[in-house]
Amino acid sequence: QSPIFGPQDVSSIEGNSVSITCYYPDTSVNRHTRKYWCRQGANGYCATLISSNGYLSKEYSGRASLINFPENSTFVINIAHLTQEDTGSYKCGLGTTNRGLFFDVSLEVSQVPEFPNDTHVYTKDIGRTVTIECRFKEGNAHSKKSLCKKRGEACEVVIDSTEYVDPSYKDRAILFMKGTSRDIFYVNISHLIPSDAGLYVCQAGEGPSADKNNADLQVLEPEPELLYKDLRSSVTFECDLGREVANDAKYLCRKNKETCDVIINTLGKRDPAFEGRILLTPRDDNGRFSVLITGLRKEDAGHYQCGAHSSGLPQEGWPVQAWQLFVNEESTIPNSRSVVKGVTGGSVAIVCPYNPKESSSLKYWCHWEADENGRCPVLVGTQALVQEGYEGRLALFDQPGSGAYTVILNQLTTQDSGFYWCLTDGDSRWRTTIELQVAEATKKPDLEVTPQNATAVIGETFTISCHYPCKFYSQEKYWCKWSNDGCHILPSHDEGARQSSVSCDQSSQIVSMTLNPVKKEDEGWYWCGVKEGQVYGETTAIYVAVEERTRGSPHINPTDANARAKDAPEEEAMESSVREDENKANLDPRLFADEREIQNAGDQAQENRASGNAGSAGGQSGSSK
């Protein structure tokens, strides 16, 4: 008895697809060894058609896939566009050769069934409408017309021209004639359900002179499209239900035993399990819409269905589309923090992973909003202007080649709590969702800037100091000037050896920044922060206002301005004469060409100044003891 198990007999019809699941014993070796699907030849040789090593035969090119699910100890072979030539004996197995562990599978592909010549075949999807055409001779033009459904030997009337309608077809069936036609009548049956399938007979007249037509109605259940996604990646369900339901409410539901639980609909309903990671987007006026889910979890695997009904809930006899989602736990997307906590007045540094093969892709950060169907306006991006309300407190630091970028948000308020998405214009699977939780601060912030009312005078020297606690002793301290395209780190100057952290004086850890001489363009937001290599930590921000020296105002001696800094036993001093280039940053329209739900932040009309590279600073002051 083979330890591999699967379906012995698989049958389908031409043009269709099959999805064959093979089960293997749960061992480490089995999980990682080669999986294969081969065709048994008359000579006993089994020719590989597809394997998990990446091999794909010519006859399967473009129509087959093999996916391993180690966490379930299964692998799935999908074969599309079946033809009768695919009928035969196959093996699904494990091992480096096709003689290892295997299971025999018989596949039979038949032709689409044919019916007697006088039978018209109607094939419709669930929820759709069928129009059955019934021809008759002139002699029966004034006779009773009817449509009945065969049940065994009997034929039960569905509708007739005396206005009788079978209760199960009430409000769904109508009998009519078109224009001046005298030899044909029609029966429409709408909101088709599976039990409507079968053989129908339409008749004009009675007795031996009656005209009869046979109609075979096939009502197709939606065949689920199989979707294979990695853990933590994202999936988009594209739903096209047709023009006839364009004005009805739309929904996506997840099958749960015999019910289908709505995850999201256009009437504002949303499953709390998908809070912060789902968007429903209307695509056009013809009823097309898509649902995007990010941060896929193991428990998201299952059967999904989209549909339309005025109630926004699944209803029998209304059109649907179906999917089966598999979530592969062997994910290329790294595990990152799903919840980040901050305090009012403080800051957070959020690390966003992206596909390392796409280091040149544009990076973005958006805020998921619950209103209506969910939306995610971009707040910051590598080429996107920072959204209004975030000036001076939000920046994106790209770290090319590292497979991650960092978004820093400071001056936190409780209103900043919520869900945020990291995304790029590249691999759409790499969308991560972060929940930011901001609590009221109970203590002073770790980083404090003095003076807090920072007004610098043109032509003079201006110094601001950032006080940090001993816990940041070993980390790199920096000042940067915030602009619409990031926060550009200013040149630093570290004088002398640092004192041992054992004797760190909590009150005297200072990093200072000096502007000398102050220019009008020095006005703006400055950040003081700490980092370790590419890992960014706490930041604090201060707005430096610049004003003209008023007549009679005292000239500030640079020495006095730095007096406090000079007394500091541990200090790093920086000075900047940063100049900025005029630069208009616009969001790449390709990013969401097909995803309008993520709002474009780069189409703001105003022109924003984006700083260039910081120039080198001259005349640093300050000392280290």
């Epitope: 198990f5 379906p7 012995q8 007999d9 698989v10 049958s11 389908s12 019809i13 269709n16 697809s17 099959v18 999805s19 064959i20 699941t21 089960y23 299964t74 669930i126 599976p194 197709l220 259940e221 939606p222 065949e223 689920p224 099958k255 035993k257 015999e258 019910t259 289908c260 299952g302 059967h303 269905q305 029998e316 179906a322 089966q324």
Partner: nanobody, 126 residues
């Protein structure tokens, strides 16, 4: 709610045949799996065979000991899953249950099924 009802059980001589049927009523979806299991007195419920379908594709599974003797099928019009049992042996005796699920799971496991019928007794005498 989905209801499953088994029928067709009875007493049969070894080598004889029986046709069991599992009728489903209530809400069903496009992809579905139905499995046949049997339980001999004092023993665990064991897998006999299963059928699953999705659109116009059908997948049939059998336990090794019944392969070639039992055939599982699906009657769309009647919404039933018959189990044709030929060349019956005394060890085939037991209560036969059918189970149903809308999920794609390992059909051999009882835990894969969300709904169960009450069972029908099959006795094979020697």
């Amino acid at each position: 709610e989905v209801q499953l009802v088994e029928s067709g059980g009875g007493l049969v001589q070894a080598g004889g045949s029986l046709r069991l049927s599992c009728a489903a009523s209530g809400r069903t979806f496009g992809s579905y799996s139905m499995g046949w299991f049997r339980q001999a007195p004092g023993k665990e419920r064991e897998f006999v065979g299963a059928i699953s379908w999705s659109g116009s594709s059908t997948y049939k599974y059998y336990e090794d000991s019944v392969k070639g003797r039992f055939t599982i099928s699906r009657d769309n019009a009647k919404n039933t899953v018959p189990l044709q049992m030929n060349s019956l042996k005394p060890e085939d005796t037991g209560v036969y249950f059918c189970g149903g699920t809308m999920e794609r799971r390992d059909p051999r496991r009882t835990s894969a099924y969300d709904y169960w019928g009450q069972g029908t007794l099959v006795t094979v005498s020697s």
